[in-house]
């Protein structure tokens, strides 16, 4: 079961896997959760009764029974990993640790005005795992305001010691705050010839890329497919790094694929969740259990529900054998990957889906959409909400998008004359406005957060957040959309849709059924030509057909401009303004969401 609370002055006996150093018990719990085998941990806090060399040790533990004997020990804090829990998990750690020096390889030293600037530098440096910053009160004059960027093999400090007037913290790459490029391409027939930091077995290049992403030292990878000439290297995933952060040499080799860590895209692409099935493929590893199962899907469920199971192989039943049930082999290994992958034996293999909760919910695949037609179908745009006002009467006011379980992203101009959040109601999972009756459940709005630089839609900053009074339970009909990664600024989106219940022509009324229109993006230069009287800034993005005919209109404001990229939908724009609706050579102007990711995260992650 899920146990989240920490056990003070308690030590778990035995079951040690490895020891790492973490600045707090809370972070030790996160490290345990992300470790492929750790189920329990014991952290040692600083205490006069403890040997200082044991302070900040985080001992990761495993147990077949999922628990271990407890022993009383002062300064020890123990707990369980979140693997056993169903809630969303994040490795994002914004805490700053005062008077702690987190040791690692100091590979970069520079002057910084503040710890925050040092943390930003670490976040935007490809190698940096954590940093230590000497404050202006630091005794040694020449070290004051020095920002040390550090990395280690594990991503965690090699030691942590007390040191007055310094602060330490972690890179915020896992908080989606990095400006580093997000390169999603996988390059066929390519080998990156740089040093290997690790190697694992993977069934395909996508899994290899995802493993590279959550490996602390991996910056890029090379994968040898099952057709690779050298048999011993087939399905081998080589995790690589280089001093520059980029591959130094690319060699053309057939049947090899290479790519980059997705650490700068991890909030908008699944990196932990390997949901595919691999047919005629056997995964080898330590056997946990063998159970009868009706199908490979049922076998995956069994693996997902067994906390120690990492991957599985299902062998279908021989005709009329065992009531048509096949054998489901639940397996694990030291690193979470198969020790060997074999083909041609008839097995169907895959991974636990337990790790999917470590990915952002927004990366979940949604049902295929109906192409053509202007009316949407249920569940097609599950992040779209209708925002109603109750003044003067209840009615649709604006669109909006679910971006978190308590957060709606919309346009600031929607709130002109709205003097209180209490008069607003957010309805999710709605296709037709006529579904909304007096007794239809809604989310009350606790707070309206309007960008403080907003004046009017045409001058930009047309963005607002609604904090809901209660949390949204994600279902097929209501779930979040991913924010674009800052590293995706240069992506050219080609599959963009605007949705809403707004007017279909300038003098019209709110539509009953959610409408959709596929609209091409227009460059800001082109857009500026169409709006000579306005300043089209980089914080705006435009979309529309030259000949007009399809566009957002009154009532669509605040709703999403959703673009599909690498099978994941991203909230690229917020419907903001335009001259008329669907007019020739008058594209719609949208708030360019990627430019506000920091603002969104600052507001939504505020304590």
């Amino acid at each position: 079961e899920c146990v989240t609370q920490l056990l003070k002055d308690t030590c778990f006996e035995g079951g040690d896997i490895t020891t790492v150093f973490t600045p707090s018990a809370k972070y030790c719990q996160v490290v345990c959760t992300y470790h492929p085998r750790c189920l329990l941990f014991t952290f040692t806090a600083e205490s006069p009764s403890e040997d200082p060399t044991r302070w900040f040790t985080c001992v990761l533990k495993d147990s077949v029974t999922e628990t271990l004997p407890r022993v009383n020990r002062t300064a020890a804090i123990s707990g369980y990993s979140f693997k056993q829990c169903s809630h969303q998990i994040s490795a994002c750690n914004k805490d700053i640790y005062v008077d702690l020096d987190m040791k690692g390889i100091n590979y970069n030293s520079s002057v910084a005005k503040s710890a925050q600037e040092c943390q930003e530098r670490c976040t935007d440096d490809v190698h940096c795992h954590f940093f230590t910053y000497a404050t202006r009160q630091f005794p040694s004059l020449e070290h004051r305001n020095i920002c040390l960027l550090k990395h280690t093999q594990t991503g965690t400090p090699t030691r942590i010691t007390k040191l007055d007037k310094v602060v330490s913290g972690f890179s915020l790459k896992s908080c989606a705050l990095s400006n580093l490029a997000c390169i999603r391409d996988i390059f066929p027939n390519t080998v990156f010839a740089d040093s290997n930091i690790d190697s694992v077995m993977a069934p395909d290049a996508f899994v290899c890329g995802r493993i590279c992403t959550h490996h602390p030292g991996c910056l890029f990878f090379t994968f040898f497919s099952q057709e690779w000439p050298k048999e011993s290297q087939r399905n081998l995933c080589l995790l690589k790094t280089s001093e520059s952060g980029l591959p130094s040499t690319r060699i053309k080799k057939s049947k090899a694929l290479s790519g980059f860590s997705l650490q700068s895209c991890r909030h908008s692409i699944p990196v932990f969740c390997h949901s595919s099935f691999y047919h005629d493929t056997d995964f080898l590893g330590e056997e946990l259990d063998i159970v009868a199962a009706k199908s490979h899907e049922a076998c995956q469920k069994l693996c997902t529900n067994a906390v120690r199971c990492q991957f599985f192989t299902y062998t279908p039943a021989q005709a009329s054998c065992n009531e048509g049930k096949g054998k489901c082999y639940l397996k694990l290994s030291s690193n979470g990957s198969p020790t060997k992958i074999l083909h041609g034996r008839g097995g169907i293999s895959g991974y636990t889906l337990r790790l999917c909760k470590m990915d952002n919910e927004c990366t979940t695949k949604i049902k295929p959409r109906i192409v053509g037609g202007t009316a949407s179908v249920r569940g097609e745009w599950p992040w779209q909400v209708t925002l109603h006002t109750t003044s003067p009467t209840q009615r649709h006011l604006c669109g909006g998008s679910i971006i978190g379980n308590q957060w709606i992203l919309t346009a600031a101009h929607c709130f002109y004359g709205v003097e209180s959040p209490k008069i607003l109601r957010v309805y999710s999972g709605i296709l037709n406005q006529s579904e909304i009756k007096e007794d239809t459940s809604f989310f009350g709005v606790q707070e309206i957060i309007i960008h403080d630089q907003y004046k009017m839609a045409e001058s930009g900053y047309d963005i607002a957040l609604l904090k809901l009074e209660t949390t949204v339970n994600y279902t097929d009909s209501q779930r979040p959309i991913c924010l674009p990664s800052k590293g995706d600024r240069n992506v050219i989106y080609t599959d963009c849709w605007v949705t809403g219940w707004g007017y279909r022509k300038l003098r019209d009324k709110i539509q009953n059924t959610l409408q959709k229109a596929k609209i091409p993006l227009v460059t800001n230069e082109e857009c500026q030509k169409r709006y000579r009287g306005h300043k089209i800034t980089h914080k705006m993005i435009c979309a529309g057909y030259r000949e007009g005919g399809k566009d957002a209109c009154k009532g669509d404001s605040g709703g999403p401009l959703s673009c599909k990229h690498n099978e994941v939908w991203h909230l690229v724009g917020i419907t903001s303004w335009g001259e008329g609706c669907a007019q020739r050579e008058r594209p719609g102007v949208y708030t360019n969401v990627v430019e506000y990711v920091d603002w969104i995260l600052e507001k939504t992650q505020a304590v």
Epitope: T390, Q394, S420
Partner: antibody
Framework: QVQLVQSGSELKKPGASVKLSCKAS????????MHWVKQAHGQGLEWIGN????????NYDEKFRTRATLTADTSTSTAYMHLSSLTSEDSAVYYC??????????WGQGTSVTVSS | NIVMTQSPSSLSASVGDRVTITCKAS??????VSWFQQKPGQAPKLLIY???NRYTGVPDRFTGSGSATDFTLTISSLQAEDVADYHC?????????FGQGTKLEIK
């Protein structure tokens, strides 16, 4: 069932003030706008203003803005209208009415106010 | 302010007659129009909301129609109990406004 019960008739002198009450029951008082409407004898309906009890947000017709004050007591589910500087023009029946999902769906029985010297 | 002009101000019809009352808005109010019935000495009662939706319990001889600026209340077959004042009102924007009312009598 939803009910709006208004206070009894009032006889006031010109220049005086009056405070009318409207007690709501049978629904969540804080979740609906309460409106006040005036009807002079033999005349049509005239909107005065509204209040949202959960936030005390109010709107008024310009004509009544300086003299009418709408308040709500959520602990007793009662809405109030205070009308000051009364003149004979204010002699009328005053209704409180709940703005339901799309319209004014429930009305109080009305309070008759007579302003006479 | 949006002005709602109601006509006629009074009308007399026989039981079984088809009766039509109109309301014209000075600007587009989409379909945010309601119709109320008020019998002597009573508070108004909601008949029609959203221009054409019959309120719970209202007999189906009452029909509302229209959008934008022109709205109609129709009583398909007048009954004796329909003698009352009828008011239209817009709730599209503040201040809310009503028509002057129509007095309906039986011949």
């Amino acid at each position: 069932q939803v009910q709006l019960v208004q206070s009894g008739s009032e006889l006031k002198k010109p220049g005086a003030s009056v405070k009318l009450s409207c007690k709501a029951s049978g629904y969540t008082f804080t979740r609906y706008w309460m409106h006040w409407v005036k009807q002079a004898h033999g005349q049509g309906l005239e909107w005065i203003g509204n209040i949202y009890p959960d936030s005390d947000s109010t709107n008024y017709d310009e004509k009544f803005r300086t003299r009418a004050t709408l308040t709500a007591d959520t602990s007793t589910s009662t809405a109030y209208m205070h009308l000051s500087s009364l003149t004979s023009e204010d002699s009328a029946v005053y209704y409180c009415t709940r703005m339901g999902f799309y319209a004014m769906d429930y009305w109080g029985q009305g309070t008759s106010v007579t302003v006479s010297s | 302010n949006i002005v709602m002009t109601q006509s006629p101000s009074s009308l007399s019809a026989s039981v079984g007659d088809r009766v039509t009352i109109t309301c014209k808005a000075s600007e587009n109010v989409v379909t945010y129009v309601s119709w109320f019935q008020q019998k002597p000495g009573q508070a108004p009662k909601l008949l029609i909301y959203g221009a054409s939706n019959r309120y719970t319990g209202v007999p189906d001889r009452f029909t509302g129609s229209g959008s934008a600026t022109d709205f109609t209340l129709t009583i398909s077959s007048l009954q004796a109990e329909d003698v009352a004042d009828y008011h239209c009102g817009q709730s599209y924007s503040y201040p809310l406004t009503f028509g002057q009312g129509t007095k309906l009598e039986i011949k």
